[in-house]
């Protein structure tokens, strides 16, 4: 057992049919030495009396606040939470497995460039009883700050027959700087929390490996006399990196239709600008990425060819 | 130790391709280290992040742009000076910052140089001729050094009595290859933004 | 199986034009770029041009505009590729190429020979 | 116009041991570089697409590198049946352009 916070503490549990479980003691938190009483939640039941209660902890009905009072006065709360471990594995039921970069990811981050901000989120078929708190550090030995804001519920979408909540949180490395050469991982802690259950999952990489630009921003077409070529200029994103010719980016340029499957022209440039053919009814498109250490791409930008 | 922005530098030039091939050549050594040491521990992920410039050259500090010198946080260890002159400045303006900056690059080169030397030398007893280091790399490290032209001591090859723990070899491989590839940025970066300055 | 085939080898006298024809086969027509590449013998590959068939847009190398022209016909799945103004040096295997990219080529025809003798 | 210049123009080989062939732009394409094989009276086939991009059906001994005006098509080990010319093709800018070809000879 450990405590997760102030009067709220973890039962580390082996889950599996006719388990032992933990044996836990609680104490009264109180300078009272006689008539203490305790009940769980919100029974009237008494469970035991004393200044501590020794209780045996094997399923979720044996997890919740347990209160001791005296006279009919509150003296202290103990919130036990559980957390369950099944063949050796902590579960993972609050969270969705995203699988994207691989499986049993649950937690994903990205940054829009090198400044130490980055954004986290996760997914979960849960709407309701549940608390996520959030903690990161650089390196795990010997950490440096990296300060977290809370958890936000950031979108909700149906999937078939059940809807799926999406959470994230914004977090800023301390003392960052751009153009350092990353050797410590940031590592991300979220204790997830849902009625008595406790989770914690964690995520670690280097801000390096989770760039993804903004999209290019300011897209304009020219089109060129007597061709059928056009010409598409664009600028940085505003939330890039500067100076630029230090974190330049590289850009895809593609002329595609509505479906696609659909015949594009497509072209790849260090350029803020880049001629291609224009068809009817399709779309010019801009993405763009690291130069020089190739992570994701930003989503497109696009505009019409019309 | 920042670099100052400078009038445009025809001499630049050939630093900026030399320094575009050296990213290009050691990313596809790691891959290529990546894919055949498979079974071993070279994923990002799986090595331990090492500097072997670290303590003995300043690269990232003594190349920042000048627009990050206001950045208290990218200002904290910059000690080390290395006074120069190098053929990639080819302009007698070019600042002693600049000539720092590239000579720690210089620097870094002929440690990896040496590394890689030293490594090739072990890999190339392995019974089972698993991976060598590709000798283009070893050619675009030399050419760079080269286009940088700074005079500097000679660092003797490693050698080593004992003999080579192959298992071993090839994780410092990985691990100094991931480690150069971010170097390699570090100094594409770097060659870029004096290119335009 | 995406498949070209183009008509048979040809000889022309300097000055005349040759028509040569590309027929396509599996997939629509209209979902390819169509290019013409030509190789002299012994020689290297040149691209001539293209066509984008769902619409008849057309783009020449520089080198050969106002004496190439290329057509679509989507109700047979054919390309055309007709060069005028013959001359000796016009001799080559002219090969249709498609993409659904505009600018590089996945499928090949097998080539016809042009021969361009007096 | 783009000028390709592909090295070297032949390219002696035992079989079984790597090669590499090395193709040069006249400016910066970026990786609007494509690699194709040519046998004796047939079609050239495309290997690589964007400098690296590897082709279905294409085997993996062909690997493509390079960005900017320096390319390099590798074969890891070659076999009897690669022994073809091969071309590379820039699609920066129209006109598109060919190297002059690489011919890949048993030694």
């Known amino acids: 057992i450990w405590e997760l916070k102030k009067d709220v503490y973890v039962v580390e549990l082996d889950w599996y049919p006719d388990a032992p479980g933990e044996m836990v003691v609680l104490t009264c938190d109180t300078p009272e030495e006689d008539g203490i009483t305790w009940t769980l939640d919100q029974s009237s039941e008494v469970l035991g009396s004393g200044k501590t209660l020794t209780i045996q902890v094997k399923e979720f009905g044996d997890a919740g606040q347990y209160t001791c009072h005296k006279g009919g006065e509150v003296l202290s709360h103990s919130l036990l939470l559980l957390h369950k471990k099944e063949d050796g594995i902590w579960s993972t039921d609050i969270l969705k497995d995203q699988k994207e970069p691989k499986n049993k990811t649950f937690l994903r981050c990205e940054a829009k460039n090198y400044s130490g901000r980055f954004t986290c989120w996760w997914l979960t078929t849960i709407s309701t009883d549940l608390t996520f708190s959030v903690k990161s550090s650089r390196g795990s030995s010997d950490p440096q700050g990296v300060t977290c804001g809370a958890a936000t519920l950031s979108a909700e979408r149906v999937r078939g027959d059940n809807k799926e909540y999406e959470y994230s949180v914004e977090c800023q490395e301390d003392s960052a700087c751009p153009a350092a050469e990353e050797s410590l991982p940031i590592e991300v802690m979220v204790d997830a929390v849902h009625k008595l259950k406790y989770e914690n999952y964690t995520s670690s990489f280097f801000i390096r490996d989770i760039i993804k630009p903004d999209p290019p921003k300011n897209l304009q077409l020219k089109p060129l006399k007597n061709s059928r070529q056009v010409e598409v200029s664009w600028e940085y994103p505003d939330t890039w990196s500067t100076p630029h010719s230090y974190f330049s980016l590289t850009f895809c340029v593609q002329v595609q239709g509505k479906s696609k499957r659909e015949k594009k022209d497509r072209v790849f440039t260090d350029k803020t600008s880049a001629t291609v053919i224009c068809r009817k009814n399709a779309s010019i498109s801009v993405r763009a990425q690291d130069r020089y250490y190739s992570s994701s791409w930003s989503e497109w930008a696009s505009v019409p060819c019309s | 130790r920042n670099l100052p922005v400078a009038t445009p530098d025809p001499g630049m030039f050939p630093c900026l391709h030399h320094s575009q091939n050296l990213l290009r050549a050691v990313s596809n050594m790691l891959q290529k280290a990546r894919q055949t040491l498979e079974f071993y521990p070279c994923t990002s992920e799986e090595i331990d992040h090492e500097d072997i410039t670290k303590d003995k050259t300043s690269t990232v500090e003594a190349c920042l742009p000048l627009e990050l010198t206001k950045n208290e946080s990218c200002l904290n260890s910059r000690e080390t000076s290395f006074i120069t002159n190098g053929s990639c400045l080819a302009s007698r303006k070019t600042s002693f910052m600049m000539a720092l900056c590239l000579s720690s690059i210089y620097e870094d080169l002929k440690m990896y140089q040496v590394e890689f030397k030293t490594m090739n030398a072990k890999l190339l007893m392995d019974p089972k001729r698993q991976i060598f280091l590709d000798q283009n790399m070893l050619a675009v490290i030399d050419e760079l050094m080269q286009a940088l032209n700074f005079n500097s001591e000679t660092v003797p090859q490693k050698s080593s009595l004992e003999e080579p723990d192959f298992y071993k070899t090839k994780i410092k491989l990985c691990i100094l290859l991931h480690a150069f590839r971010i170097r390699a940025v570090t100094i594409d970066r770097v060659m870029s933004y004096l290119n335009a300055s | 199986q995406v498949q070209l085939v183009q008509s048979g080898a040809e000889v022309k006298k300097p000055g005349s034009s040759v028509k040569v024809s590309c027929k396509a086969s599996?997939?629509?027509?209209?979902?390819?770029?169509l290019h013409w590449v030509r190789q002299a013998p012994g020689q290297g590959l040149e691209w001539m041009g293209w066509?984008?068939?769902?619409?008849?847009?057309?783009e020449y190398a520089p080198k050969f505009q106002g004496r190439v022209t290329i057509t679509a016909d989507e109700s047979t799945s054919t390309a055309y590729m007709e060069l005028s103004s013959l001359r000796s040096e016009d001799t080559a295997v002219y090969m249709c190429?498609?993409?659904?990219?505009?600018?590089?080529?996945?499928?090949w025809g097998q080539g016809t020979l042009v021969t361009v003798s007096s | 116009d783009i000028v390709m210049t592909q090295s070297p123009l032949s390219l002696p080989v035992t079989p079984g041991e790597p090669a590499s062939i090395s193709c040069r732009a006249s400016q910066s394409i970026s990786i609007n570089l494509h690699w194709y094989q040519q046998k004796p009276g047939q079609a050239p086939r495309l290997l690589i697409y964007?400098?690296?991009q590897s082709i279905s059906g294409v085997p993996s001994r062909f690997s493509g590198s390079g960005s900017g005006t320096d390319f390099t098509l590798t074969i890891s080990s070659l076999q009897p049946e690669d022994f073809a010319t091969y071309y590379c093709?820039?699609?920066?800018?129209?006109?598109?352009?060919f190297g002059q070809g690489t011919k890949v000879e048993i030694k």
């Open positions: 066509i984008d068939p769902e619409n008849g847009d057309t």
């Open positions: 964007f400098a690296s």
């Open positions: 599996g997939g629509t027509f209209s979902d390819y770029y």
């Open positions: 190429a498609r993409n659904k990219e505009l600018r590089y080529f996945d499928v």
């Open positions: 093709q820039q699609s920066n800018s129209f006109p598109l352009t």
